[in-house]
Interface confidence: low
């Protein structure tokens, strides 16, 4: 599996798309996991409905929310205010019994936020160094990495 | 679809007020940064004021340009933005854009026209 | 307040040939965590303005690839590979490292 990359800015909201055959997992149910180490386990973080007719119900763990259009064959995790430590490699998995097939492998970047430095005389925010909450999708930046690539810096 | 939807614009006398009114849908108006930004008959665009998303406390900033004359708000409740513009000028007349601001003012209104005139 | 100038402020184009317009700050908008806060926007006659370019170099989204920004603290360039007859309209530029945010006077496309 080639990693695919996803940017997103700090406390804004970023949402991963993990395209699939929807006919070739029919029944499964996914989840997400977190690469811990290069060649470590997946750690769960979290996993669609039980029922997998209600896979397209939002499912929370903490700020990380998963949701899954069957028909379509798309895996939608949302990472809600996006912090310097989410950064890391995932993975979007199809659950059958014990075993795990991965859809797609994740490189999460975080970018600073684009307000976090203003220097505004008396324009200054209250706190303008705290960031964005929530900024959604629109603007989440998804590009292939390419073989042997260095991602830049997750955070500045 | 994000859509922004500006109204309240018209013709009022110099010294004159005016409340301009945005309507957000297709996104979480409370997450987000909302601002007005201005463009007067055949000239450039004026970023006018900004107005902070919840995680912010919804604190505001103005160009000086239009401090103290003008206020940003926002009704949550009705995901709608609001430019209370008082002691109005000549010089303010222009179509009124509101914008929602990520990285840049991403998604705009199709904007509302302030006439100040005598 | 940072000062945008942008030029020229009219750019008669041939559809198929590359246009450049260039952007100059009063102040460098590069900022010590290696972003440089400049935008591109495209007001299409009759429309409202539309983010093309952010942080210099980033294509918003739904952007076509023809378009790309490029430059140093001070001078920007916007280049589109091929122009289209859909790219007429006015391109600006603006500064979002300080407040108040600040726009170039804005370069006037069309074809020729």
């Known amino acids: 599996h080639n990693t695919t990359v996803f940017q997103g800015v700090a406390g804004q909201s970023l949402q991963v798309s993990c395209p699939y055959d929807s006919m070739k997992h029919w029944g499964r149910r996914k989840a997400w996991c977190r690469q811990l180490g290069e060649k470590g386990p997946c750690q769960r973080v979290v996993s669609t409905h039980n029922l997998w007719l209600l896979s397209f119900l939002r499912r929370w763990n903490g700020s990380t929310a998963i949701t899954d259009d069957t028909l379509g064959g798309t895996l939608t995790i949302t990472l809600r205010n996006l912090q310097p430590h989410d950064a890391g490699l995932y993975q979007c998995q199809s659950l059958h019994g014990s075993e795990a097939d991965t859809l797609r492998k994740v490189l999460v970047e975080v970018l600073a936020d684009p307000l976090d430095h203003r220097d505004a005389g008396d324009l200054w925010f209250p706190g303008e160094s705290e960031s964005f909450e929530d900024a959604h999708v629109e603007h989440s930046i998804s590009r292939s990495l390419l073989e042997g690539e260095i991602p830049f810096p997750p955070t500045s | 679809e994000v859509q922004l939807v500006e109204s309240g614009g018209g013709l009022v006398q110099p010294g004159g007020s005016l409340r301009l009114s945005c309507a957000a849908s297709?996104?979480?108006?409370?997450?987000?940064?909302m601002s007005w930004v201005r463009q007067a008959p055949g000239k450039g665009l004026e970023w006018v004021s900004v107005?902070?998303?919840?995680?912010?406390?919804?604190?505001?900033g103005y160009n000086p340009s239009v401090k103290g004359r003008f206020t940003i708000s926002r009704d949550n409740s009705k995901n709608t933005l609001y430019l209370q513009m008082n002691s109005l000028r000549a010089e303010d007349t222009a179509v009124y854009y509101c914008?929602?601001?990520?990285?840049?003012?991403?998604?705009w209104g199709q904007g509302t026209l302030v006439t100040v005139s005598s | 307040d940072i000062v945008m100038t942008q030029t020229p402020l009219s750019l008669p184009v041939t559809p198929g040939e590359p246009a450049s317009i260039s952007c100059q700050s009063s102040?460098?908008?590069?900022?010590?965590?290696?972003?440089?806060?400049l935008n591109w926007y495209l007001q299409k006659p009759g429309q409202s303005p539309q983010l093309l370019i952010y942080?210099?170099?980033t294509r918003a989204s739904g952007v076509p690839d023809r378009f790309s920004g490029s430059g140093s603290g001070t001078d920007f360039t916007l280049k589109i590979s091929r122009v289209e007859a859909e790219d007429v309209g006015v391109y600006y530029c603006?500064?979002?490292?300080?407040?108040?945010?600040?726009f170039g006077q804005g370069t006037k496309v069309e074809i020729k």
């Open positions: 297709g996104f979480t108006f409370t997450d987000f940064y």
């Open positions: 107005i902070r998303n919840k995680a912010n406390g919804y604190t505001a």
């Open positions: 603006q500064q979002f490292l300080e407040y108040p945010f600040t």
């Open positions: 942080w210099m170099s």
């Open positions: 102040k460098s908008l590069l900022h010590s965590n290696g972003k440089t806060y």
């Open positions: 914008a929602r601001l990520t990285y840049g003012f991403d998604y």
